[in-house]
């Protein structure tokens, strides 16, 4: 799993827009039957915030055990709480499941902070507001753990929607959305629609909210506006994607877009912030605050360790740049654009002190593992993991928070030269040179 | 369009007082204070109030002597200067400043490079 902060949390090349638009999604090849349209039941069915993670009701074992489990595009375990921890409302009580089947066999799994460990089993799962069928799914009873559940959260296990490569303790061990496909008719696509609040939640807030959708076998149109952009997925571990460009208030940070995607770039729901590889992040924070120059903040709120609060209501968001990803579209040197708004990277925190002020957290953090898109960048749009055909598409979300000045957007086409140029590939060790 | 404008200031014996106003008018304003200059020196923090949760600050010289306090609107900030020193001898000038951070110290409440917002100044001149 992604390293740093990830939930649960622990506390190129542009150019001009090409004249034609390309054919909009819709107008493709006709797909499988059951693929699109509308899924009613589906939407609304997640919960949660950005902070603590957005989670879906599943249950586990004859007679069902109902769990909350966060949705995580950046790993491939499914594991629960299987033990009592003082953070768990519930837990799954293997012995009272008559379909749980043990598999012998350990798991372990560190994070740079923190860490869970447990017994590997399959047991009979489904997701009551998800397709109507029940899989045998491999699962991970957490037995112990180290700052992994949060206080508060109100979920009691992780669903890793990401590919078998990264599976705990290898990549035998199947993950659940490939169980689900492979033992039923649903389609191997999943789509979510994450929906930040624009202000603070308490617990209470968050039970009685809405969420977002992960709409599972398809995509439903009435959880975005426009059109939906594909962009490939690079190697079927991760989510991986290109970035070719970045652009702060339309202004190019002119790096080489290798950097962008040093030593990958992964769309990941269970990261909090937008984390850009060290230099990046560098170049991102000196350009927003040559932006935003009307108002000085300290080096802790760049750092996203220091709140910055304004009084109710009068945040500036126009003081604030809009940011720009340019993904490698689906043609050759085709790209399109994702643009997120303060209202997505300025995340807000309830701040002890004061209750009538608005605060935020600066929610772009740098990291050592490459670029992860985590639920600051997802808020702004309807984000489809389209597993089938191999590629990751983007729409402008209808449940993002904008002001009557700006929208988030998703715009091309853009025509991108050598965009396989911008893609890093990490060095694979050779097992013989670590022969004595 | 932003304006702070002060007013109070003026000539006063040693130990006197004065009380100096400013009114703000543009945005709504999370910091206020008050700093001031005198003839060949930098400009340096005296006090300031967070309009949000009410913390103030003072510089050391002035503790215990002057007082800074806002109405109820919020938009005018007071400096009640007592037992006045002829080294209170300055320009003060009345900033603002939209936003407040979470452990900010004394020092960088008082520091002028955090206000983006500044008034024109009013003298205040203590003679023995």
């Known amino acids: 799993t992604q390293h740093g902060i990830r939930l649960p949390l622990r506390s190129g090349l542009g150019g001009a827009p090409l004249g034609l638009r390309l054919p909009r999604e819709t107008d493709e090849e006709p797909e499988e039957p059951g693929r699109r349209g509308s899924f009613v039941e589906m939407v609304d069915n997640l919960r949660g915030k950005s902070g603590q993670g957005y989670y879906v009701e599943m249950t586990v074992g004859s007679p069902p055990q109902t769990l909350n489990i966060l949705v995580d595009t950046g790993s491939s375990n499914f594991a629960v709480g299987a033990a009592p921890h003082p953070f768990l409302h519930r837990y799954y009580q293997r012995q009272l499941s008559s379909t749980y089947r043990d598999l012998r066999k350990g798991v372990y799994v560190p994070y740079t902070q923190g860490k869970w460990e447990g017994e590997l089993g399959t047991d009979l799962v489904s997701i009551p507001h998800g397709p109507n069928v029940t899989v045998r799914a491999n699962i991970a009873a957490i037995t112990e753990s180290d700052k992994f559940f949060i206080n508060g959260s109100n979920w009691e296990g992780i669903l890793g929607l990401a590919y078998a490569e990264i599976a705990r303790p290898d990549d035998s061990l199947e993950p659940f959305f490939d169980s689900l496909v492979k033992q039923t008719h649903v389609p191997n696509l999943f789509s979510l629609q994450l929906c930040g609040a624009g202000f603070p939640l308490n617990q209470s807030e968050v039970l009685a909210s809405v969420g977002g959708s992960m709409i599972i076998g398809g995509i439903d149109h009435s959880l975005y506006t426009g059109s939906l952009w594909y962009t490939p997925i690079r190697r079927e571990w991760y989510y991986e994607v290109i970035i070719v460009r970045v652009e702060i208030n339309g202004q190019d940070l002119k790096m080489d877009c290798k950097e962008y995607n040093y030593d990958k770039s992964i769309v990941d729901s269970g990261t909090t912030n937008l984390r850009l590889p060290k230099k990046v992040f560098e170049a991102a924070v000196k350009s927003i605050k040559a932006a935003s120059s009307t108002e000085k903040f300290p080096d802790g709120f760049w750092l996203g360790e220091q709140l910055v609060c304004w009084q109710a209501g009068t945040t500036p968001w126009n003081i604030f740049p809009v940011i720009s990803l340019y993904l490698m579209g689906e043609v050759t040197n085709q790209s399109f654009r994702i643009t997120i708004l303060p209202q997505q990277y300025l995340r807000p925190v309830e701040d002890v002190a004061t209750s009538q002020d608005d605060c935020y957290k600066f929610a772009i953090s740098q990291s050592s593992t490459g670029t992860v898109m985590g639920a600051v960048i997802m808020e702004g749009f309807y984000v489809v993991f389209d597993r089938a055909r191999k590629r990751i598409g983007f729409a402008v979300s209808a449940c993002h928070v904008h002001d009557e000045f700006r929208t988030a957007a998703v715009e091309g086409p853009f025509v991108t030269l050598d965009m396989e140029d911008c893609g890093y590939n990490i060095p694979q060790t050779d097992e013989s040179t670590l022969m004595t | 369009d932003v304006q702070l404008q002060e007013s109070g200031g003026g000539s006063v014996q040693a130990e006197g007082s004065l009380r100096l106003s400013c009114t703000a008018s543009?945005?709504?304003?999370?910091?206020m204070g008050w700093f001031r200059q005198a003839p060949g020196k930098e400009r340096e923090g005296v006090a300031v109030?967070?309009?949000?949760?009410?913390?103030?600050y003072y510089a050391d010289s002035v503790k215990g002597r002057f007082t800074i306090s806002q109405d109820n609107a919020k938009s005018t900030v007071y400096l009640q200067m007592n037992s006045l020193k002829p080294e209170d001898t300055a320009i003060y000038y009345c900033?603002?400043?939209?936003?407040?951070?979470?452990?900010?110290?004394?020092?960088?409440?008082?520091?002028?490079?955090?206000?983006?917002?500044w008034g024109q100044g009013t003298q205040v001149t203590v003679s023995s």
């Open positions: 543009g945005y709504t304003y999370s910091l």
């Open positions: 900033a603002a400043r939209r936003s407040w951070f979470t452990g900010m110290t004394t020092t960088q409440a008082l520091d002028p490079d955090w206000f983006s917002y």
């Open positions: 109030i967070n309009s949000g949760v009410g913390t103030t």
